[in-house]
Amino acid sequence: APVRSLNCTLRDSQQKSLVMSGPYELKALHLQGQDMEQQVVFSMSFVQGEESNDKIPVALGLKEKNLYLSCVLKDDKPTLQLESVDPKNYPKKKMEKRFVFNKIEINNKLEFESAQFPNWYISTSQAENMPVFLGGTKGGQDITDFTMQFVSS
């Protein structure tokens, strides 16, 4: 069966949108009006993972691009990256662990916890125009809460 996917955009809890910053990086900034068209559209795939009653495993690809958010160690630190994949083989139901995020819904907000690195979350900075990154703290300065907007296929 083809993996179930939906198209969506994400905004952090301060309403910053996510846009491409170079070929392999995302950044978060406030967009308005026609600039909203710059925000990345994700293809969120529902995949196998350590699913629980509170966590749904997903993979986050960039729509119509062979790029997926993935979590790897760089200089001994969990790091978020955009990784290029073979479009013939992705998305798939059984994604490698580095591509999997646990989608957690709390009070109408979403968190995306790395399956590879528990308690590390997709994060944005308070500051404008900064890279989206993998952060190891919740409830601090950095933002780990997002809202999701559905996009028609």
Partner: antibody
């Protein structure tokens, strides 16, 4: 060698809480999930739920409101608690190890304990 | 939840016979289908995973095939120790669900 062993009281009174322990060896509970499955006498198998290596749980809907699965990694033990039991909860209860092979086979249960019969009766 | 329909519910056969059991899923589960053998008073034992893969130590007379919704489990030549109850299990998504079981008896 992977081994799982269930233990607990064989008789529980209606409305009380059924408590079982699964003691494992040959693998670490931090690395592998453990499921609970039950089988009423002469009937088929029903998957109850599981606890993952990181401690997250998934409970099957029909039992969700009455079920708690927890673990103690240092003791290599997983526990199951089922509250407000009735005669319908009489069954052999099994624990089983998840295969946990990411990108290949996460959800298959590859090793099982021998099971323990729990009878709910006054 | 995914429903697993297993048939037949019981089966009589003789040593040396070829035996086939089928399992049908209510939705497409790719190849995430396992087969277990259970003898009276014993725990289920994994015989086949991912529709057709035999774990180490499982005799080659056991085989499985299928994908999507329709799956088959075959014992090519029944041995005396094969008389038991067999269950399919879908491991595609939670909650995991079993077939009703097939009791294989001596004719």
């Amino acid at each position: 060698e992977v081994q799982l062993q269930e233990s607990g009281p064989g008789l529980v009174k209606p409305s009380e809480t059924l408590s079982l322990t699964c003691t494992v060896s040959g693998f670490s509970l931090t690395d592998y999930g453990v499921s609970w499955i039950r089988q009423p006498p002469g009937k088929g198998l029903e998957w109850i739920g599981l606890i993952w290596g990181g401690g997250d749980t998934y409970y099957n809907s029909p039992l969700k409101s009455r079920l708690t699965i927890s673990k103690d990694n240092s003791k290599s033990q997983v526990s199951l608690k089922l509250s407000s039991v009735t005669a319908a909860d009489t069954a052999v209860y099994y624990c089983a190890k998840q295969r946990n092979l990411w990108g290949y086979d996460l959800y298959t249960m590859d090793y099982w304990g021998q099971g323990t019969l729990v009878t709910v009766s006054s | 939840d995914i429903q697993m329909t297993q048939s037949p519910s019981s089966l009589s056969a003789s040593v040396g016979d070829r035996v086939t059991i089928t399992c049908q899923a209510s939705t497409d589960i790719d190849e995430d289908l396992n087969w277990y053998q259970q003898k009276p008073g014993k725990a289920p034992k994994l015989l086949i995973s991912l529709a057709s893969t035999l774990p180490p130590g499982v005799p080659s007379r056991f085989s499985g095939s299928g994908s999507g919704t329709d799956f088959t489990f075959t014992i090519s030549s029944l041995q005396p120790e094969d008389f038991a109850t067999y269950y399919c299990l879908q491991s595609d998504r939670f909650p995991l669900t079993f077939g009703q079981g097939t009791k294989l008896e001596i004719k």
